[in-house]
């Protein structure tokens, strides 16, 4: 089994905490945004 | 580069302590940081990690609640939040490279905590 | 949480020798397990990572090898050196498992 098949846990948690951290930047610009139309 | 833990003392039972793990010539927010212990005459015993970069902790089943990982810019703490006699051990941290996938390659010399009335 | 189990707890070998220790993970944890050595006083030694990859500076009389729950430390050559316990420990993180890193209770090896 070479390490190169995979991609390991570490490199999954990294890329999952950036996804988390784009939609948590996305979606509290939109808040913003909603706010500020109000 | 290098870890150096501290704070390790004599205390009695119930009253909070805090060791801090000090990082030399890295920059903490770049790793996953372990703390681990190892009683007198023990194995190694897992206790729960911090990844420095975001600050998420995550501790194994019997250390919550007993245990609580924080960060600053230079340094991990644990605190034992009530010791009792059976915290009695020398306390590890350890760096992941970078993560924890390849294992933890950069240790601490230990810090020796006593909790005993 | 995963568990790890090693065996044997002890074990004896003779200079020039071969040592081999089992570690069992309760569940898979691909490659990623990682071996450890200690001596008294000291804070452990990565010795082995990914299952099978060798540590920067560990002699290759050490080696590594398994995949999910099994997996075998062979020390090929045993040197007096050598007489210390060893650890295994889960380097698989995932949600499900709460990312945690348990170690496995300790091999000791004594060099005859």
């Known amino acids: 089994h070479s390490d190169g098949i995979f991609t390991d846990s570490y490199s999954r948690y990294r890329k999952q905490m950036a996804v988390k951290k784009y939609l948590a930047a996305v979606l509290g610009k939109r808040y913003k945004q909603r706010v500020k139309n109000k | 580069q290098s870890v150096e833990e501290s704070g390790g003392r004599l205390v009695t039972p119930g009253t909070p302590l805090t060791l801090t793990c000090t990082a030399s010539?890295?920059?903490?927010?770049?790793?996953?940081m372990i703390w681990v212990r190892q009683a007198p005459g023990e194995g190694l015993e897992y206790i729960g990690f911090?990844?420095?970069?975001?600050?998420n902790t995550y501790y194994a089943s019997w250390a919550k609640g007993r245990f609580t990982i924080s960060k600053t810019s230079t340094t991990v703490d644990l605190k034992i939040t009530s010791p009792t006699t059976e915290d009695t051990a020398t306390y590890f941290c350890?760096?992941?490279?970078?993560?924890?996938?390849?294992?933890?390659?950069?240790w601490g010399q230990g810090t020796l905590v006593t909790v005993s009335s | 949480d995963i568990v790890m189990t090693q065996t044997p707890a002890s074990v004896s070998g003779a200079v020039g020798g071969t040592v081999t220790i089992k570690c069992q993970a309760s569940?898979?944890?691909?490659?990623?397990l990682s071996w450890y050595q200690q001596k008294p006083g000291q804070p452990p030694k990565l010795l082995i990572y990914?299952?099978?990859t060798l540590a920067s500076g560990v002699p290759s009389r050490f080696s590594g090898s398994g995949f999910g729950t099994e997996f075998t430390l062979t020390i090929s050559g045993v040197q007096c050196d050598d007489a210390a316990t060893y650890y295994c420990?889960?380097?698989?993180?995932?949600?499900?498992?709460?990312?945690?890193?348990?170690f496995g209770g300790g091999t000791e090896v004594v060099v005859k």
């Open positions: 420990q889960n380097n698989y993180g995932t949600r499900r498992n709460n990312y945690v890193f348990p």
């Open positions: 990914k299952a099978s």
């Open positions: 911090i990844d420095a970069g975001d600050g």
């Open positions: 569940q898979s944890i691909r490659n990623e």
């Open positions: 010539g890295i920059d903490l927010s770049s790793y996953a």
């Open positions: 350890a760096r992941g490279d970078p993560g924890w996938s390849n294992g933890f390659a950069l």
